[in-house]
């Protein structure tokens, strides 16, 4: 632990002004693991003037950083690049004349306290004012900058011409695209100071390339993958003061695929589990031994999880018997195509026959509408009857 400091497994605090520290505290190689340090508290260190790029990087678990009543004049731009857990920074009463938002833009800070620093009045610090105004909490800090006569001017009363938030404007065509096709997005940015623009495509799978000038840019996405449906694409304008973004959601239309269809499992009900992907939402139709299966309250499709264009569900059967054994085929269909898969279901053996004998499936299904417990509806093949079984439950709601 450095002189003038005390260290524990999770904290470093340096508040003794004599002899004091002249550099950001670093731990000896064989002492406490810096990754476990969550709080660093520094006070009364008039000779501590700089935080270098590599001073804080070892403290990846750091959540609270306090440097107060000290001599801090300069913070390197990438000083906190590796400290993604930082939530509270307090630089009260130091010697900071300027501070860039680039230090903090990647952090999700809940508190940044900068009171009592001799900031120079300039566009460089207007992001702090913008941040303050955006927070609009009752405990706003009284932040000042120094004018040409070295007098304190409240940031709240400061106006800087040609120093404002930028704007981004995304001119997107209809962002509903068929799988495999290509699309080009255009974006224009404006602002003073002139902003930089960049594209934020998140984890886009499809191949993409951008062309960007200062105020105009285009993003071409080729051979669009169905995996990108629902992804957000943003055009971001950024300058000294802050950033603005305009976003669009990509909708990819594609033919259905049944990615999963398994033999029945028994829980509260019997369930033939399936997963279907498709956009627009596919209509589902079940066949039993080659004939349309008209659903009823005893045998029906239930969607349990919808994940954008992927639907996880069951063909749910209430108390099926040997009468329900057979081949179940799921057909998923939308305007871009269809897919089908089949499984064989064996719920129970025929009465009087050993369950393990696995007899042939019956050629005749008894249409015993009075037997509610195993009523699976009319299974004769009436080709003029194709009920719409859109992926909803009986109440018409998606799950």
């Amino acid at each position: 632990c450095p002189t003038s400091c005390k260290c524990s497994a999770s904290r470093i605090w340096c508040s003794d002004p004599s002899p004091g520290i002249v550099a950001f505290p670093r731990l000896e190689p064989n002492s406490v693991d810096p990754e476990n340090i969550t709080e660093i508290f520094i006070a009364n260190q008039k000779r501590l003037e700089i935080i270098n790029e590599d001073d804080v990087e070892a403290y990846v678990g750091l959540r609270n950083l306090t440097i107060v009543d000290s001599g801090l004049k300069f913070v390197a731009h990438k000083a906190f690049l590796k400290n993604s857990n930082l939530q509270h920074i307090n630089f009260t009463r130091n010697k900071l004349t300027s501070l860039s938002r680039k230090h903090f833009r990647h952090l999700d800070l809940s508190e940044l306290i900068l009171v009592g620093n001799p900031f120079t009045c300039s566009c460089d610090i207007m992001w702090i004012k913008t941040l303050q105004e955006a927070k609009s909490s009752p405990d706003t800090q009284d932040l000042y900058c120094l004018n040409e006569s070295s007098k304190n001017i409240p940031l709240a009363n400061l106006q800087i011409p040609n120093c404002g938030l930028p704007s981004a404007n995304l001119a997107a065509p209809n962002l509903t695209v068929e799988e495999g096709k290509s699309i080009t997005l255009s974006c224009s940015v404006a602002g003073d100071p002139v902003p930089n623009m960049y594209w934020d495509v998140g984890n886009l799978v499809s191949k993409h390339m951008n062309e960007t000038s200062h105020t105009q840019g285009s993003l071409r996405i080729t051979n669009i993958s169905s995996d990108d449906s629902g992804k957000q694409i943003s055009c971001v304008a950024e300058n000294l003061v802050g950033e603005d973004q305009d976003s669009v959601n990509l909708t990819v239309h594609f033919a259905p695929t049944i990615t999963f269809l398994e033999s029945p499992t028994s829980d509260h009900h019997w369930c033939i589990p399936f997963t279907v992907k498709g956009n627009p939402k596919p209509a589902l139709q079940w066949f039993y031994n080659g004939a349309i299966l008209n659903e009823s309250k005893y045998i029906c499709t239930k969607i349990h999880v919808t994940n954008h264009t992927e639907y996880h569900g069951c063909l749910q059967l209430d108390n099926p018997t040997h009468m329900n054994n057979g081949d179940y085929t799921l057909i998923a269909k939308n305007e871009y195509g269809k897919d089908e898969k089949q499984i064989s279901a064996h719920f129970m053996g025929w009465p009087g026959i050993d369950d393990g004998a696995n007899p042939n499936y019956p050629d005749v299904i008894y249409e015993d509408y009075g037997t509610a417990a195993n009523d699976i509806g009319d299974t004769t093949n009436r080709s003029n009857e194709i009920p719409s079984t859109d992926v909803t439950d009986k109440t018409g709601r998606e799950h």
């Epitope: 300039s122 070295s150 304190n152």
Partner: antibody, heavy 118, light 112 residues
Amino acid sequence: DVKLVESGGGLVKPGGSLKLSCAASGFTFSSYTMSWVRQTPEKRLEWVATISSGGDYTYFPDSVKGRFTMSRDNAKNALYLQMSSLKSEDTAMYYCTRESGRGDFDYWGQGTTLTVSS
Amino acid sequence: DVLMTQTPLSLPVSLGDQASISCRSSQNIVHSNGNTYLEWYLQKPGQSPNLLIYNVSNRFSGVPDRFSGSGSGTDFTLKISRVEAEDLGVYYCFQGSHFPWTFGGGTKLEIT
């Protein structure tokens, strides 16, 4: 000899706008912070606005913040005060002043009168 | 805001007499940089105000040495050792230490 000459005052209705000008001579205008100070009919003085030497920032008291803007043209040795959403309490004599490097108002113009009345 | 209170409101003096004007601030006006931005201005009848004293006690160029300023913290005084006819007018104190900067209400120096 330092000289500051204001112009542009007049009679304006409440809610109206007006732009005051100040022509400076006798010193290197672009090196000095400039301010506007007003004097009410009751003879009270009130600081109103300040602009830095390069025109890169301005500041105002809360009483005029958001309604007044201040600008300068260093090539023309000119200072401006754009006033909008005027109120009767803005009625005053408006003085253009030079700020010394120490922050005091070391030179004043002769003033221009603004009257806000319906 | 810092309130600057001047007394008296009106000060009748005879030529050659000493005059003293008081200015009291509602809070300490020492700036964080150590300076005290306390100024005195004189507005002669029909004219614009003119700077007399800056930083409590420094005379502006061309101001006669019969004018002197003193004080600290919250209490400040302008003294005119031997009043002359050209000194009549309204005297204003001003603080430029704490934003927003404020003037006192003025003291009218009248010759009796």
